[in-house]
Each structure stands twice: as C-alpha cells, then as structure tokens.
C-alpha cells in the first residue's frame, strides 16, 4: 500500500509544496513520484519514505506516489489545488445619464481567479450588496438590474470578488473594481411653460419667461431661449426642483413679422421644448394733416387722416367710409374752430389683437379783432361814489390789445375796481388792435349824482 501526505493541498499559484511518499513495506523495491511539475527530492529520506518539494505550481495537479513491495505495486495521488485572485474585475461603464424610474443594468466582468467554486462576484452600491453570484465562464460575466431613483444620483457602483478559502487557509481574498458614479436625472414629460407677449411693437422691449418644474438635478439643467434665429441670454433662477429663465427682448425693424419663440430645457440626454408664435409689428401713429394749420375765418380746410395700409381710422370719432386707412372732411373755419383738436384714432389687428394709435392736430383760426355789445356794452350808468369795475372784452386771434380813452388821453380802467367820480363821466373811444387790423367802439359812462336818488 502506498501513502501520500498531505493528500490535499491548497496553495497560491506559483507556490511550492512538500509531499511525503511512503510504502507499507519496510524495504520497497522501488518508491517514487510521477508529476509534470518541477520536483526535488529532499534528502535524507527513510527506508520506506521519500520527501519531495514541488515548485512553481501554476495549475491544479495530481502528483502520484508509487511503490513496489513484495506483495505488489500500488500508488496514491495528492490533490494540489491552486488559488489565485482574479486578474481583472471590471464594472462596465454606466450610461452618462440614467433616467429616474428606469431600470439600470449593472454588468461586471471577471477575468481569471481560482478555484472558481470558491469565487463569488458581488455588485455593490456603495458598500451595500445588490447581488451575489458565482463566477461562471471565462471571463465570468455577472449582471443585475436595479431600479433607479433620485437618491441614486451620485451613488458609486462597483463590483467585488471574494475568494473564500477560510475552510483551508483561513483567508478571504477581496478584489474590487474601480467605482463608477451614476448620474441620474428626471425630466418631466410636460413641456416648459413659456410666458411672453403674443405681439410686440418694433422698437419696444418685451420680457420672456420660460419655466419648468419637476427637474432633477435642477443644477444640471440647461436652458436655450431663442426668438427666431436670435439667441437670447436668459437669467436663470433655480428652485428646489424648478427653474425659471427670464430674458429681455428688444425688437428692431429687422424683427418685423412672425417669429417662433423657442424654449428648450436640456437635462441628461433629453430635451423638452415649447414653441410660441410672436408677431412683431410696425405701426406708426397715424398722420393728421390740415390743408394749413393756421387759416383765416371763412377759409375752407381739409382735415385728412392717414394710417398704416392695413389699419382702420376714425377721425374725431367718425369712422372712415368705407372703413380703411384714410379719412377726411371739409370745414369752413369759424372763430369757434380756433384751438379745435382733430383727433385720428387708428386700429390695427395684429395676430387677433387690436392695437391702437392716436394723433391729434390743432387748428388755429385767425379772426377779429372784434368788439361786441355783449362783451363791451356801449352804455354804463353808475351812482357816484359807488365801487364799479368797467368791463370790455375784445375778441380775436391773435388776441387784440384794447385801449379805451376819453378825449384821447383819459383812460377807462378796464377790469379794475374804481370809485365812481364825476371825472369818470363821458364818452370813451375803445380801440381793439391786432396784426389783422383794428376796430373802435364808443362807450358812454353816465354818473348819477346822489341828489337824484
């Protein structure tokens, strides 16, 4: 009977081991070991035993001891099990961005490592074990699927191998892959909310606000705002899970027409867009034309109002007939028309909205000078010593100068409070003079003495 010791050995790859071969008889005819491994006999041996050192053991092997005794030939094998940790433990790259609510597949590749029966592959989130599987195949590939939430943003995922040799050598060997950080994102299915004027007048400024709620992580969101081909530079305000982008838009004549206002919110590898039509219009105030802004009374005046070709005008509240961009009327100028305002109101429909513009012109009517009985009575009778205010109003445009003189020298104090004396009595010649000429009127003042009362 041939014996081998130890009957089983677990050793690191490339390691050495001493194996004892012994025969059951005292004087074996032959005693030895058969192995492809490099072996060296350790001397001195005994009559019925030999010790061998096997070196550079790279793989599992079963060296065989044999002996030849008088009662026959026999052999025995020792089981050499080589252990080694994996040469490569690698977690497959994670997607650059992972949508929240979608499952993530983690994939780990393990190259090498033995004995495989003692090799376990674990997928980890931080230090938390997500999955534990045996290593099968070369390379071994282990996968697991995990649901992804917002709290997984920034989490580190890795793959770890455990070579558990505790039953044999009281050792546990661990290899961990480089960690991969997960970036998750949540972009709602709802498009951004866009608030902007539907119509904007050329050479004015408008404000555009684009906002979106339910974003995660909001700090990573990018906003693109454009009016037509013009890139807008918004000021972005971030909330907990929301953002608001505000931009000022100054529109010039180049922008006149229909433009698309576009707001795009980009997060992860997704975009949500909202488009809105903005109509930019040019609408100068209507022109109010008078044949002449200054005319003499009795002159015929044409008042004309003209606006944007697509506008409808009203002149002094009267719509153009037929409705359109032009209205006019004819009048004979009277003094009452002096300072009269002619107002033209133009209305233009822009993208279903009515916009209004007004223009006003004043007519100056030259007339007079005039001295009427109504405003400059020809006769005054006042009691002596009473307080009176002589009144005489001259009319005209330009406003005439008025003088009332008795005997060419003594003035009547028009508009002033006076004590009536005998000196005030008499006939005054009132003269109203302007650049248009002069008119005169006699005014008589009678003074009643107290004896007549």
């Amino acid at each position: 009977q041939t014996s081998v010791f130890p009957p089983e050995v677990i050793l690191p790859r490339g390691g050495s081991v001493k194996v004892n071969c012994s025969a059951s008889c005292d004087q074996p005819i032959s005693l030895g070991m058969e192995t492809p491994l490099p072996k060296k006999e350790i001397l001195p041996g005994g009559n019925n035993w030999k010790m061998y050192e096997l070196s550079n053991v790279q793989e599992d092997s079963q060296p065989m001891c044999y002996s030849n005794c008088p009662d026959g030939q026999s052999s025995a094998k020792t089981l050499l099990t080589v252990y080694w940790t994996p040469e490569r433990v690698e977690l497959a790259p994670l997607p650059p961005w992972q949508p929240v609510g979608k499952n993530l597949t983690l994939r780990c590749q393990v190259e090498g490592g033995a004995p495989r029966a003692n090799l376990t592959v674990m997928l980890l989130r931080g230090e938390k074990e997500l999955s534990r599987q045996s290593a099968v195949g070369e390379p071994a590939e282990v996968t697991t699927t995990v649901p992804v939430g917002r709290d997984d943003h920034g989490a580190n995922f890795s793959c770890r191998t455990e070579l558990d040799l505790r039953p044999y050598v009281l050792k546990l060997f661990e290899n961990t892959s480089a960690p991969h950080q997960l970036q998750t994102f949540d972009l709602p299915a709802t498009p951004p909310q866009l608030v902007s004027p539907q119509v904007l007048e050329v050479d004015t400024q408008g404000t555009v606000v684009c906002s979106l709620d339910g974003l995660f992580p909001v700090s990573e969101a990018q906003v693109s705002l454009a009016l037509g081909d013009q890139k807008l530079n918004p000021t972005i305000t971030y909330g907990n899970n929301s953002l608001s982008a505000k931009a000022s838009v100054k529109v010039t004549a180049e922008e006149e027409g229909t433009q698309q206002l576009l707001c795009g919110v980009m997060l992860g590898n997704q975009t949500q867009e909202t488009r809105q039509t903005v109509t930019i219009y040019s609408f100068p105030a209507p022109n109010v034309n008078l044949t002449k802004p200054e005319v003499s009374e009795g002159t015929e005046v044409i008042v004309e109002c003209e606006a944007h070709p697509r506008a409808k005008v009203m002149l002094n509240g009267v719509p153009a007939q037929p409705p359109g961009p032009r209205a006019q009327f004819l009048l004979k100028a009277t003094p009452e028309d002096n300072g009269r305002s002619f107002s033209c109101s133009a209305t233009l429909e822009v993208a279903g909205q009515l916009v209004h513009k007004n223009q006003t012109r004043e007519l100056r009517v030259l007339y007079g000078p005039r001295l009427d009985e109504k405003d400059c009575p020809g006769n005054w009778t006042w009691p002596e010593n009473s307080q009176q205010t002589p009144m005489c109003q001259a009319w005209g445009n330009p406003l005439p100068q008025l003088k009332c003189l008795k005997d060419g020298t003594f003035p009547l104090p028009i508009g002033q409070s006076v004590t009536v004396t005998r000196d005030l009595e008499g006939t005054y010649l009132c003269q109203a003079r302007s650049t248009r000429g002069e008119v005169t009127r006699e005014v008589t003042v009678n003074v009643l003495s107290p004896r007549y009362e």
Epitope: S224, A226, G228, D229, Q230, K231, A253, E254, E255, E256, G257, T258, Q259, Q260, L262, G264, I280, S282, P284, H308, P309, R310
Partner: antibody, heavy 119, light 110 residues
Framework: QVQLQESGGGLVQPGGSLRLSCAAS????????MSWVRQAPGKGLEWVSA????????YYADSVKGRFTISRDNSKNTLYLQMSSLRAEDTAFYYC????????????WGHGTLVTVSS | ASELTQDPAVSVALGQTVKITCQGD??????ASWYQQRPGQAPVLVIY???SRPSGIPDRFSGSSSGNTASLTITGAQAEDEADYYC????????????FGGGTKLTVLG
C-alpha cells in the same frame, strides 16, 4: 404650395437700368418679408436687399445702396427690384426669397432670373 | 461687414457622416441657417434656428452651434446630397441684414 417666379432679367449695357419682378403665390404675401439674393455665375450667394411685409422698412447691401430700389405691391402679390447705374459686377442670377420676418432666413426661393451687364 | 467662413470643399464616403462648419462672430448672437444648392438649381433651406428642419428635409440633416461656429451634419450621406452648402446668418455688425458663407462643395464618394 409656395411659388416664387422672377422675371425681367436680360442683357443691359453698363449704366443702364432694369426692373425685376417676382410674382408670389401660395402664401399670404403681405405677412412675409421678401428679399433679393444674387449669385454671379460660378460664385457664391450674396444678399442684395430686403423689404418688410408692410413695405415700411427696406434694407440694402453696400454694393447696391443708392442704385437699387426694392418695393412691393401687396395688392398684386408682387415684389420688385429697380436697378439703375448697372455695372459689370452686377451680372448674376437674381433670386427672390420669402422670410417669416424681415431679418429671417429664407423659407422659399424662386428659380432665378439672369441679369447680364455688358457692352 | 461681418464674414462667415466655410471650407471650400469637403468629401465623404457614401453612407458615412460628414460635418460642414461655418465660423463667424455673428454666430455668437444668431443661429445659422443652411441651404443646399444642386447644380443649376435654386437654393433650398435645410436647417434653420438651433436645429430645425423644414418639412420634406430628411432627418439625416442636423444642425448644431457652439460659440462662433455653426455646423451642419449629414449622418449617412447619400449620393443625392452632393451639392454646394451655404451657411447664412444675421449680420451682427449692422452693415447688412444677412450674410452668406462662401459655400462648401460636398462630394459623395463611391
């Protein structure tokens, strides 16, 4: 569908005048800005002039300012380019094109009309 | 006037991806539009705004913008894509309303 058809091209002597027309159909003409773009034979595109939908604003390239006049008749759905003091370097295919707004990109183009300035 | 600069010529193998670029200061403020012109034909708008295609333009055409550069990308170029391509933008210098690049002649090989 949108159609733009230029006409009025031909051979003209240096210093001469020519009026190009562009008849438009298939869209609301008065709501669109219109432009003229030219292309000398074998060369690239060059913007020439533009006019707003209402006709209230007009724009010209420096190379034609003071010599060319753009206008439109919205009642006839027609765009015009009055060209005077013509030079040899004005020889080109002249395209009319429409834009949703005055400074905007060109949505549709006509097939072009050739203007040759030569003595 | 501001200028837009394009490579005069670019070639691509059939079915491969090609990027045509356009550079100019105005592109910091405005998006470029891109026009395709086949020999003897009028130009046709293929891309406008940030990356919008008019109806009828295949989705293999796409646009992008970064800084002072605009790009037109054709993913999976077809023989019928062989043409001149012009970029065009508003003129931020204010001298002209719009300016064109010099054009890029695209050749599809194979």
């Amino acid at each position: 569908q949108v159609q733009l058809q230029e006409s009025g091209g031909g051979l003209v002597q240096p210093g001469g005048s020519l009026r190009l027309s562009c008849a438009a159909s298939g869209f609301t003409f008065s709501s669109y800005a219109m432009s003229w773009v030219r292309q000398a034979p074998g060369k690239g595109l060059e913007w020439v002039s533009a006019i707003s939908g209402s006709g209230g604003s007009t724009y010209y390239a420096d190379s034609v300012k003071g010599r060319f006049t753009i206008s439109r008749d919205n009642s006839k759905n027609t765009l015009y380019l009055q060209m005077s003091s013509l030079r040899a370097e004005d020889t080109a295919f002249y395209y009319c094109a429409n834009s949703a707004y005055t400074g905007g990109w060109y949505d549709y183009w006509g097939h072009g009309t050739l203007v040759t300035v030569s003595s | 006037a501001s200028e837009l600069t394009q490579d005069p010529a670019v070639s691509v193998a059939l079915g491969q991806t090609v990027k045509i670029t356009c550079q100019g200061d105005s592109l910091r403020t405005y998006y470029a539009s891109w026009y395709q012109q086949r020999p003897g034909q009028a130009p046709v708008l293929v891309i406008y705004g940030e990356n919008s295609r008019p109806s009828g333009i295949p989705d293999r055409f796409s646009g992008s913008s970064s800084g002072n550069t605009a790009s037109l990308t054709i993913t999976g170029a077809q023989a019928e894509d062989e043409a001149d391509y012009y970029c065009n933008s508003r003129d931020s210098s204010g001298n002209h309303l719009r300016v064109f690049g010099g054009g890029t002649k695209l050749t599809v090989l194979g």
